[in-house]
């Protein structure tokens, strides 16, 4: 049987054979991959990149959250959507997950001018069906998925909007465990609206296998701030394995080459 994919830290600290990022197969070896380092001064301003419109993001819900063995994931089940932001169509929210380390400078997947952040949050959306502009696009869409990526850094205050998620972590230490979060809205997790005006855009891939090259990425310039203990909770409460021997951390794919692609900014 083929080994399952994993992160470097899992291979280093476990006896189970698994495929580390450099050995991920299929699309993962292609040339339009994510994440990337964004050189902020090289990104050209594109006037078409306007503000986002968030639908259902403000609705308080009791979200299901699970440990999927690679990250912690909130199931969003089309209960919210986005449009605007230079996107070609509305996109339905599917799931939210995060990437992190146990140290401040290396938990994000994307970097800005070579700087990594403590964490990165991805809200994954799928393009609403029947909205592609032409047949070629519908068959081979490079923007079938829209990911909103938020960098996370440490601040001095507890971020109350994140508390329902942070408090749920204790209930899902092992892979395949799930729980229901205290009522919260997606908007609670986001920076204030005025901080969502500045973002970077490029075409790339999923950052986990199968690394499909069908993602339109939005990386917001302004980071979310969480308290130190909120950030550390992710690496302290969650495990990659059912035996709880390998702490879940460093679930970060190494940077990929930008190649011939361009990054634009709002």
């Amino acid at each position: 049987a083929e080994s399952h994919w994993c992160y470097e830290v899992q291979a280093e600290s476990s006896n189970y054979p698994c495929l580390v990022p450099v050995k991920w197969g299929g699309n993962c070896q292609k040339d339009r991959q994510s994440p990337i380092n964004i050189v902020t001064t090289k990104a050209k301003v594109d006037k078409k990149l306007g503000r986002f419109f968030f639908s259902g993001y403000d609705k308080k819900q009791t979200w299901t959250v699970q440990n999927n063995g690679h990250s912690v994931m909130m199931l969003l089940e089309n209960k919210a959507s986005i449009s605007g932001g230079g996107l070609p169509a509305p996109y339905q929210a599917k799931q939210l997950h995060l990437h992190w380390s146990d140290l401040p400078y290396k938990g994000s997947e994307h970097s800005l001018d070579g700087e990594h952040f403590a964490m990165e949050m991805h809200i994954v959306h799928e393009k609403e069906k029947g909205t592609s502009r032409n047949v070629k696009e519908a068959q081979d869409p490079e923007d079938e998925i829209a990911v909103l990526a938020f960098l996370v850094e440490a601040g001095t205050q507890v971020n109350e909007g994140f508390q329902p998620l942070v408090e749920a972590l204790s209930n899902i230490p092992k892979p395949e465990m799930s729980t229901t979060m205290a009522e919260s809205s997606l908007l609670d997790l986001l920076p204030k609206e005025e901080k969502l005006r500045h973002y970077f855009r490029y075409l790339g891939s999923l950052t986990t296998p199968t690394c499909d090259e069908k993602v339109v990425w939005t990386v917001f310039r302004e980071p979310i701030q969480l308290h130190r203990e909120q950030i550390l909770a992710f690496s302290q409460k969650l495990y990659y394995d059912k035996e709880q021997t390998v702490s879940m951390k460093d679930n970060v794919r190494p940077l990929q080459q930008l190649g011939q692609r361009t990054v634009i900014k709002s």
């Epitope: 380390s101 146990d102 140290l103 401040p104 400078y105 700087e115 990594h116 403590a118 850094e153 440490a154 601040g155 001095t156 130190r228 203990e229 950030i231 550390l232 690496s235 302290q236 702490s247 951390k249 460093d250």
Partner: antibody
Framework: DVQLVESGAELVRPGTSMKMSCKAS????????IEWIKQRPGQGLEWIGV????????HYNEKFKDKATLTADKSSSTAYMQLSSLTSDDSAVYFC????????????WGQGTTLTVSS | QIQITQSPAILSVSPGERVSFSCRAS??????IHWYQQRTNGSPRLLIK???ESISGIPSRFSGSGSGTDFTLSINSVESEDIAVYYC?????????FGAGTKLELK
């Protein structure tokens, strides 16, 4: 009261290794990062690296990657730094410090360990 | 990595005078600068965090200001116990870096 107490001064031969300690008290050891800083005589402060005592995760200044190894023992609330292949350039005072926020200021410092490398 | 420049290298003052230390970053770092005092043969002691936030137990004569690239630490009435070297540290980017320090001495 938060306190970081470092091990005593050391005189060692070139080419050898040594391990210094930093014992923490007065707070939850695993909840704060421990940083290590080098100060050569009459010089400024140079950051060596950081350890998360809860997980053992480390991050080093590129300059010290092959020189320093950071570890921590949760049971005794003690952080350690081992320095290898010592030369006279390693003669310095070494401080441990607690990071007050995640990735920010150093709010409590040890008294320093003086290392002298000489034959 | 971000370079931190402190000036002047040495400041000579009389007791009771107001004194200011300057710290400049090679790129904008918001308010992620912290100030330390190190007396002879002692450990650094945190004086000011995030450019201007006071620290419990530090005398009120110490204050900080600035944002972006230019920062100032002020002592509004120098006392003899303030004789020390003063360092600033940026925590905006890894690796964290310190200035070379400003030595405060009495005239």
């Amino acid at each position: 009261d938060v306190q970081l107490v470092e091990s005593g001064a050391e005189l060692v031969r070139p080419g050898t290794s040594m391990k210094m300690s930093c014992k923490a008290s007065g707070y939850a050891f695993t909840n704060y990062l421990i940083e290590w800083i080098k100060q050569r005589p009459g010089q400024g402060l140079e950051w060596i690296g950081v350890i998360n005592p809860g997980s053992g995760g480390t991050h080093y200044n590129e300059k010290f990657k092959d020189k320093a190894t950071l570890t921590a023992d949760k049971s005794s609330s003690t952080a350690y730094m081992q320095l290898s292949s010592l030369t006279s350039d390693d003669s310095a005072v070494y401080f441990c410090a607690r990071e007050g926020d995640y990735g920010s200021r150093f709010d409590y410092w040890g008294q320093g360990t003086t290392l002298t490398v000489s034959s | 990595q971000i370079q931190i420049t402190q000036s002047p290298a040495i400041l000579s003052v009389s007791p009771g005078e107001r004194v200011s230390f300057s710290c400049r970053a090679s790129q904008s770092i918001g308010t992620r600068i912290h100030w330390y005092q190190q007396r002879t043969n002692g450990s650094p002691r945190l004086l000011i965090k995030y450019a201007s936030e006071s620290i419990s137990g530090i005398p009120s004569r110490f204050s900080g200001s600035g944002s972006g690239t230019d920062f100032t630490l002020s002592i509004n009435s120098v006392e003899s116990e303030d004789i020390a070297v003063y360092y600033c540290q940026q925590s905006n980017s890894w690796p964290t870096t310190f200035g070379a320090g400003t030595k405060l001495e009495l005239k």
